[in-house]
Interface confidence: low
């Protein structure tokens, strides 16, 4: 999809005459009809397959055509197409005399054609204008033309569609050649894969949007590199998820059984000796003169 643009620059009709040689009265009030069609070795009658456009009356006899792209877009003339640009074309430009304000073909007198030019050839897509001048015995037309791609279309034939987007289907802008340029935080062929938080563990973490690090089951921490011990693990750690490796002095499935009661609780009194004897088990050996379970008597 693209646009063939035609910039009319100057039309010279010094004698103010029609193609028949008859003079216009009072002067040739000139407008143009443009027909753009597929390449023909000899431009032939038939539909304007690539489009057609007409101008209002632009001047009388000889005149320069001002650039009016800001005020209504009349010059350059726009001939949009919605197909792959083939690289070749035929262009017919007719200058007509309009005695009145009605420019419809049926409203014009039978002898209203001033001049007709037909060119054909190759034209690549690009920003640069190609300038041309066509003369016949009575008139001269100077003009420039080019083909540019429509918005969101790129490439040598304006066939590469790239519409910048920032939604579920992708997060990208378009390069001049139509290739995708991912927005920050996104990667992948279609820029639909988020780049996770820097350092996010490759196996244990993932993300659904950029700079995120969502932990898989069994992992925790900002970078999902810390395992989660077994639920209920009291005095233990893990090296893999759901493990409960007991700290020194603790035992049992949940590391909640005290294997060092004497040290942690000092239950024996009056200088007696404490001996650990299994989980939460201990015995006090009293000094002479003391008795009781904790040598408290």
């Amino acid at each position: 999809s693209g646009v063939f643009q035609l910039q009319l620059q100057e039309f010279i009709n010094e004698r103010g005459v029609l193609a028949s040689g008859r003079p216009c009265e009072p002067g040739c009030r000139t407008f143009f009809r443009v027909c753009l069609k597929h390449f023909q070795a000899v431009v032939s009658p038939g539909p304007c397959t690539f489009g057609t456009v007409s101008t209002p009356v632009l001047g009388t006899n000889s005149f320069a055509v001002r650039d009016d792209s800001s005020g209504g877009g009349r010059n350059p003339l726009q001939l949009p197409f919605n197909f792959t640009w083939p690289g070749t074309f035929s262009l017919i430009i007719e200058a007509w005399h309009a005695p009145g304000d009605d420019l419809r073909p049926e409203a014009l007198p039978p002898d209203a054609l001033i001049s007709k030019i037909a060119i054909q050839g190759s034209l690549a897509v690009g920003q640069n204008w190609r300038t041309d001048e066509q003369n016949d015995t009575l008139t001269r037309l100077s003009y420039s033309y080019r083909v540019i791609c429509s918005d969101n279309y790129y490439g040598e034939s304006c066939s590469r569609l790239c519409k910048k987007r920032d939604d579920h289907f992708g997060h990208y802008e378009c390069q001049p050649d139509g290739s995708l340029s991912c927005l920050p935080g996104w990667t992948g062929k279609y820029c639909d894969q988020p780049i996770c938080l820097s350092g996010c563990h490759e196996q244990n973490g993932y993300c659904s949007k950029p700079d995120e690090c969502i932990c898989r089951p069994g992992w925790q921490g900002r970078l999902c590199n810390e395992c989660i011990p077994h639920n209920g693990c009291r005095h233990g750690t893990c090296s893999i998820p759901w493990q409960c490796a007991c700290d020194e002095g603790w035992g049992g499935l949940f590391c909640d059984q005290d294997l060092n009661y004497c040290t942690h609780h000092s239950p024996c009194k009056n200088g007696s000796t404490c001996s650990n004897s299994g989980p939460k088990g201990y015995t006090c050996t009293c000094l002479p003169g003391y008795t009781g379970e904790h040598c408290e008597l």
């Epitope: 569609l161 519409k163 910048k164 987007r165 939604d167 579920h168 289907f169 279609y190």
Partner: antibody, heavy 119, light 111 residues
Framework: EVQLQQSGPELVKTGASVKISCKAS????????IHWVKQSHGKSLEWIGY????????NYNQKFKGKATFTVDTSSSTAFMQFNSLTSEDSAVYYC????????????WGQGTSVTVSS | DIVLTQSPASLAVSLGQRATISCRAS??????????MKWFQQKPGQPPKLLIY???NQGSGVPARFSGSGSGTDFSLNIHPMEEDDTAMYFC?????????FGGGTKLEIK
């Protein structure tokens, strides 16, 4: 003339799988996407997902992930949808539809394939 | 998921009169200046047929009596003048976000 011709009705047992085909003609198959849509009896339409006929990229409705699998065979211009572990809830008419760009939509549809799941 | 609520659920309109069907989205379905809203017609035993895309653009070969309007969350389908052939179910559908979703449908009949 653009046409999408779907395979015939299916009567399948609970727990089985079914593979529906959608043969395209009359247009450039690989330039388009094929969508799959479910319509339970007397109910609205439910989008299952789509597959790119160009590169096989898929996008599924989360509800049907693991249930539906899309494939294409570009040599025969045919799209397929396999539906697994069928239950009575999967009894419905399934349509394929083509799409060229997200701004136009599903402009041509297959005639629909009726799937009946029986115990 | 974006929920589309159609109203009314059923509608009876006299021949030659105007039928208006509404579709409200639970959130905006506009993106980059485009409304990702479509309208489909479905007759019994037939697949849906695309009527309107991008909220207001007519599908290929769709009669001019079908027109769509709206943006953001509120959309409508107008049929005028109503013809006998227009008796059908009508569905709106959004394609802004996955999963694409359809409205519950409106049954249009001749009064």
């Amino acid at each position: 003339e653009v046409q999408l011709q779907q395979s015939g009705p299916e009567l399948v047992k609970t727990g089985a799988s079914v593979k529906i085909s959608c043969k395209a003609s009359g247009y450039s198959f690989t330039a388009y996407y094929i969508h799959w849509v479910k319509q339970s009896h007397g109910k609205s339409l439910e989008w299952i997902g789509y597959i790119s006929c160009y590169n096989g990229a898929t996008n599924y409705n989360q509800k049907f992930k693991g249930k539906a699998t899309f494939t294409v065979d570009t040599s025969s211009s045919t799209a397929f949808m396999q539906f697994n572990s069928l239950t009575s809830e999967d009894s419905a008419v399934y349509y394929c539809a083509r799409d060229y760009d997200y701004d136009v939509g599903m402009d041509y549809w297959g005639q629909g394939t009726s799937v009946t799941v029986s115990s | 998921d974006i929920v589309l609520t159609q109203s009314p659920a059923s509608l009876a309109v006299s021949l030659g009169q105007r039928a208006t069907i509404s579709c409200r989205a639970s959130e905006s379905v506009d993106n980059y200046g485009i409304s990702f809203m479509k309208w489909f017609q479905q007759k019994p035993g037939q697949p849906p047929k695309l009527l309107i895309y991008a909220a207001s653009n007519q599908g290929s070969g769709v009669p001019a009596r079908f027109s769509g309007s709206g943006s953001g969350t509120d959309f409508s389908l107008n049929i005028h003048p109503m013809e006998e052939d227009d008796t059908a179910m009508y569905f709106c559908q959004q394609s802004k976000e996955v999963p694409w979703t359809f409205g519950g449908g409106t049954k249009l009949e001749i009064k």
